[in-house]
Interface confidence: low
């Protein structure tokens, strides 16, 4: 059987290194060898290159070496399959070794700012060694911000023959790290060369760029003062590295500029005292280049009816993500305040918030929160400066059987009566939401049984019990993931009933 | 990348006190457990204790209590675990180990810090 | 403490061969049992946790069973990269506490 006919020639001019031409099939089902018939020197020349018969090997490639690679040159190839049985020879080829040059990529050797320009990066490199002297290159520059995994790119040409090359990145972000990769290829080839090393350079730093400030309103102290937790971050969008040296508030009572009062502070976070009447909080951050624009924020006063617009809400869990969603009857608010933190019988030792917009949902990964830890999570609805009334529903990202089981004992034992009383878990221990308590009891020797109540419910009285019989009681918690049991109590129901004694007694 | 880098190996005098280090990145250690392990030469895994870096809350394995102190600054990401009144039985490679809590389980160990314990 | 005991305490197999390395707590531990490998100089590696679940990018050759006390780590078709030292290690309960560990050599 006579080979294939070799199909699908592709050649590709590594300069100044090799001219290699590659084919299908790649393998044939009896030895073959292969020769590739080339002309060139405009068709003045020609050669063979043969693949290896000493390997006895099917080898679907071939490359022509210096000195008889010439440039610029058109080529044709033609490729013969041969095999016992007798040749097969391919379609004759033509290649421009201009349309097919590969070369090596540049290398960067600077990316830095340029004093006074904002958000631009020059970046400069060495032109490939092995490249054609005189030809226009083409260029391929990608860039990310360092900490993002999508690159950007901008293509341009360069017709200098310098080994130094230049390029001004604009429109970037300030004071941010970039890493950035180039490539090459003659103007006329479809083959670029592979991506420089990444380097790595950063954009100079501007005033800040903004704040997002939010504030939590506690009781009215005994003297009328009332504590307003004021706290600001970065605006969303603020360039990573952005540092601000502090951060200057000033806030005064609703029409009455003359009792403005400031302060300055390095932290994120400052408790003013006001008193009962709207207050207008301002908050900029600075640096060594100047103050970030406003951020703005009204008080209400005490007394102040706030708006009521988030009828219900959901929290549920997707495979890695919390999702909280809210209905809301008014269209018109496209903004809301999300806070959540851990609810703990002490003092929340993370307080955390969030800024919404367009959209009626928050999400937030699993991993950024405690699994076994119970969450609070409230949903303000932001109205231009006013704040309205918070829904708030709480979430466990991962529910485990309770630490401990309830404390229980025993009261009013009677003859076939008991009741029994068991305290609330302490948050720390119930690891998720409790649902139900179930009360197994058990004569001694006797069968066990049980009696499961609501999650509400932390008192029980059990009946139809058999008089002057020791019995052993424990209350099991149980959450979604399972139940845990509190201790085991005994107790012994009485002979003879107390009312029944008395009265008997008597007569 | 998620990564623990632990401080360099250490050689101190019998006695004395060690201070290892344990810096994350590609999270961060608030939300998580950090817990230490040892291993001396040629023997398993014993466990030292863990610390929750949100609130710094501690618990020791009862053999080590009293010895180990563990710390986090989470300003650095870092976790630290001191051992005091060191001897030669302390000799070991501690480990510093990130524990997921929503499938209960070590995925991120520390690459190691070999404590020598001489005169 | 929970005692974690490991049998064998070492174990050489031929490639494709199945090596099964069992753990045992001196106590009900559930299902809370995680099983790592930690090749010479390297820093324990993690296989299988809360007994049977195999951790992402482990092969399936890879397989972990039990619950209550008894344990069972089972690598079907033996590969020469399978080497290092097996450990299994409860966190049920406080403190956590690891097996001796099991020497796994390909012949």
């Known amino acids: 059987v006579l080979p294939a006919k070799p199909e699908n020639i592709s050649c590709i001019f590594y300069y100044e290194e090799n001219f290699t031409c590659t084919w299908s099939p790649e393998k044939e089902a009896s030895y073959t060898w292969y020769k590739v018939k080339r002309t060139y020197s405009y068709g003045y020349k020609s050669d063979i290159c043969s693949t290896d018969n000493s390997t006895r090997g099917n080898h679907a490639s071939c490359s022509f070496l210096p000195p008889t690679i010439t440039n610029p040159d058109n080529y044709t190839i033609q490729v013969e399959a041969q095999n016992a049985d007798g040749i097969m020879k391919s379609d004759i080829t033509y290649w421009n070794l201009d349309a097919i040059m590969k070369i090596e990529p540049p290398e960067i050797f600077s990316v830095k700012s340029v004093l006074g320009i904002k958000r631009m990066l020059q970046i400069k490199w060495i032109r490939p060694v092995l490249a054609p002297h005189s030809s226009t290159l083409k260029y391929t520059l990608r860039f990310r911000t360092i900490n993002s995994a999508y690159w950007m790119e901008v293509n341009f040409t360069k017709e200098d023959i310098d080994r130094d090359e230049t390029y001004n990145l604009t429109e970037l972000q300030a004071f941010t790290e970039y890493v950035m990769t180039l490539r090459c290829a003659p103007a006329e080839s479809m083959f670029w060369s592979g991506w420089s090393q990444e380097k790595v350079g950063t954009t100079e730093e501007e005033a800040p760029y903004g704040l997002d400030l939010w504030r939590v309103l506690k009781p009215a102290m005994v003297d009328g003062r009332r504590p307003v937790q004021l706290m600001w971050k970065k605006a969303t969008g603020a360039p990573v590295l952005e540092k601000a040296l502090g951060y200057n508030i000033w806030y005064f009572p609703e029409n009455n500029t003359n009792l403005t009062e400031t302060v300055n502070t390095t932290n994120q976070t400052h408790e003013l005292y006001l008193g009962g009447k709207t207050y207008w909080v301002y908050v900029v951050s600075y640096n060594s280049l100047g103050e970030s624009p406003v951020a703005t924020l009204r008080i209400p006063a005490l007394n102040e009816k706030t708006f009521q617009c988030i009828e219900a809400m959901q929290a549920c869990l997707t495979q890695d993500q919390l999702v909280v969603e809210w209905q809301s009857s008014a269209p018109e608010v496209d903004t809301w305040m999300v806070e959540w933190f851990p609810d703990v019988d002490s003092e929340p030792s993370s307080f955390s918030w969030e800024s919404v917009s367009q959209a009626r949902n928050w999400t937030i990964q699993k991993d950024e929160l405690k699994p076994l830890w119970c969450y609070n999570i409230s949903v303000y609805p932001v109205l231009r400066d006013r704040v309205g009334q918070p829904y708030s529903t709480q979430a466990y990202v991962q529910e485990g059987i309770p630490s401990a089981g309830p404390v229980t004992q025993a009261d009013s034992i009677g003859v076939k009566t008991v009741t029994i009383t068991w305290k609330e878990i302490p948050k720390s221990k119930r690891n998720g939401f409790i649902k139900n308590y179930t009360i197994f009891y058990q004569a001694e020797d006797g069968k066990e049984f049980s009696k499961t109540v609501n999650s509400n419910i932390l008192q029980y009285r059990l009946e139809s019990l058999t008089r002057r019989t020791s019995y052993s009681l424990q209350v099991m918690a149980s959450t979604n993931a399972g139940g845990t049991n509190g201790t085991k109590i005994n107790f012994k129901t009485l002979s003879i009933s107390h009312h029944h004694h008395h009265h008997h007694h008597h007569h | 990348e998620v990564q623990l880098v632990q401080s360099g190996a250490e050689v101190v005098k019998p006695g004395a006190s060690v201070k290892v280090s344990c810096t994350a990145s590609?999270?961060?250690?608030?939300?998580?457990?950090i817990h230490w392990v040892r291993q001396r030469p040629g023997a398993g895994l014993d466990w030292i204790g863990r610390?929750?870096?949100?609130?710094?809350?501690?618990k020791y394995a009862p053999k080590f209590q009293g010895r180990a102190t563990l710390t986090a600054d989470t300003s650095t990401n870092t976790a630290y675990m001191q051992l005091s009144s060191l001897r030669a039985g302390d000799i070991a490679v501690y480990y510093c180990?990130?524990?997921?809590?929503?499938?209960?389980?070590?995925?991120?160990w520390g690459t190691g810090t070999l404590v020598t314990v001489s005169s | 403490d929970i005692v974690m005991t490991q049998t064998p305490l070492s174990l050489s197999v031929s490639p494709g061969e199945t090596a099964s390395i069992s753990c045992k707590a001196s106590?009900?531990?559930?299902?809370?049992v995680t099983w790592f490998r930690q090749k010479p100089g390297q820093s324990p590696k993690l296989l299988i946790y809360?007994?049977?679940n195999r951790y992402t990018g482990v092969p399936d050759r890879f397989s972990g069973s039990g619950s209550g006390t008894d344990f069972t780590l089972r690598i079907s078709t033996v590969e020469a990269d399978d080497t290092g030292v097996y450990y299994c290690?409860?966190?049920?309960?406080?403190?956590?506490?690891f097996g001796q560990g099991t020497k796994l050599e390909i012949k």
């Open positions: 180990a990130r524990y997921y809590y929503v499938s209960s389980y070590f995925d991120v």
């Open positions: 590609g999270f961060n250690i608030k939300n998580t457990f």
């Open positions: 610390i929750d870096p949100a609130n710094g809350n501690t």
């Open positions: 106590q009900s531990v559930t299902n809370d």
């Open positions: 809360s007994a049977s």
């Open positions: 290690q409860q966190d049920y309960s406080s403190p956590w506490t």
